[in-house]
């Protein structure tokens, strides 16, 4: 039994880091393998992650971590019984994939303005709470070419756009994702999308 693709890990910088790897053949990850992880600091305890299958030869492990900070550095040992298959290290702050924003809501009752709001996926005491910026994707269900991205570079989890920038009388969907420049993170997954019917009053033409 050998590792074909070495484990690569990403952290949500809150409580979970996810490591994925591939073996050289079909493997029952949960019965045959264990991923041990331990902070490099004095007196830290070793923890065991039981991997799950991720395709025939692929394995995935969800490492539970509490209160991640930039100094954290973990040793990783992948075992098959008594055989050490791979040894490595992982610094969560250097491989961050933020959690996806939630509770995306479109408020259409503000005169001719669409207000999109969502929730920051981190609690206020988490370092990323004040460092997230967002991208909002809005698209038409009727017209695949009507697809736009709005970059929200301020901290407030909201976006205002004029309803007239979208077509009237048709349905739109929106979703949002997050990233943090401070840790040069990857983008989060997209939030679940939300749907609304766009309608607004056409202004009277002046003659």
């Amino acid at each position: 039994m050998k590792v074909l693709q070495e484990p690569t890990c990403v952290s949500d910088y809150m409580s979970i880091s996810t490591c994925e790897w591939k073996m050289n053949g079909p493997t029952n990850c949960s019965t045959e393998l264990r991923l041990l992880y331990q902070l490099v600091f004095l007196l830290s305890e070793a923890h065991t992650c039981i991997p799950e299958n991720n395709g025939g030869a692929g394995c995935v492990c969800h490492l539970l971590m509490d209160d991640v900070v930039s100094a954290d550095n973990y040793t990783l040992d992948l075992w098959a019984g008594q055989q050490l298959l791979w040894k490595g290290s992982f610094k969560p702050s250097e491989h961050v994939k933020p959690r996806a924003p939630g509770n995306l809501t479109v408020h259409t009752n503000v005169s001719d303005t669409l207000l999109l709001t969502w929730s920051n996926p981190y609690p206020p005491d988490n370092y990323l709470y004040n460092h997230l910026t967002y991208a909002v994707n809005i698209w038409s269900e009727n017209d695949p070419a009507d697809f736009r991205i709005y970059n929200v570079t301020y901290l407030e989890p909201s976006l205002r756009i004029a309803a007239s920038t979208l077509k009237s009388g048709i349905s739109y969907r929106a979703r949002v994702r997050a990233w943090a420049q401070c840790y040069n993170t990857t983008w989060s997954e997209w939030s679940p999308s939300t749907k609304w019917h766009n309608s607004y009053r056409e202004p009277f033409e002046q003659h």
């Epitope: 600091f41 004095l42 930039s70 610094k91 702050s93």
Partner: antibody
């Protein structure tokens, strides 16, 4: 309110022994890593000893290895430092501290300190 | 052992001043650096952990930065109650070690 209250300090002759105690309240002692830090006059702060939450793992500074023993009683919310074969250079204020994480790192709660003087 | 060289050892500044203290590690300590404040006759208090994280309840005028071997602690606008000695502390290497302290006085 978090409180760490040290006791047991005093004047002792070289070669003598002392046991310091630290009564903890206001947080979950049984799941906290704890430590003793000392501050000698004109010297740097020094982490003397540390212990994990269940008492199964300990750390000692080289300067006290074999002479000091850190222990805890989670049922009494109390941390101990047994000091033997004391030397003049052990003279210091000893602080009971809580480790912020489950490892030896930042210390977020400190007691008021108890003074140990080793002198003949 | 990793040496933490703190400078200056003492400084005098006026209320409202921006105050900067530095700490240099003798080898790479990542961001495993902590800053404490100790007022006369009191025990140390945690201000900054993991080099730049402000501890709960600590005023935002305090900040920390740095990684590797060079670290900075800053008070953006000095207040009279900030009179104290400030210590850096690394826990990346064993044994954990402390800086010699910076005694801060008001002019």
């Amino acid at each position: 309110e978090v409180q760490l209250v040290e006791s047991g300090g005093g004047l002792v002759q070289p070669g003598g022994s002392l046991r310091l105690s630290c009564a903890a309240s206001g947080f979950t002692f049984s799941s906290s890593y704890m430590s003793w830090v000392r501050q000698a006059p004109g010297k740097r702060l020094e982490l003397v000893a540390a212990i994990n939450s269940n008492g199964g793992k300990t750390y000692y500074a080289d300067s006290v290895k074999g002479r000091f023993t850190i222990s805890r009683d989670n049922s009494k919310n109390t941390l101990y430092l047994q000091m033997s074969s004391l030397r003049a250079e052990d003279t210091a204020v000893y602080y009971c501290t809580r480790q912020r994480g489950n490892y030896v790192g930042a210390m977020d709660y400190w007691g008021q300190g108890t003074s140990v003087t080793v002198s003949s | 052992d990793i040496q933490m060289t703190q400078s200056p050892s003492s400084l005098s500044a006026s209320v409202g001043d921006r105050v900067t203290i530095t700490c240099q590690a003798s080898q790479d300590v990542s961001t495993a650096v902590v800053w404490y404040q100790q007022k006369p006759g009191k025990s140390p208090k945690l201000l900054i952990y993991s080099a730049s994280y402000l501890y709960t309840g600590v005023p935002s005028r305090f900040s920390g930065s740095g990684s590797g071997t060079d670290f900075t602690f800053t008070i953006s606008s000095l207040q009279p109650e900030d009179i104290a000695t400030y210590y850096c502390h690394q826990y990346y290497g064993s044994p954990p070690t402390f800086g010699g302290g910076t005694k801060l006085e008001i002019k």
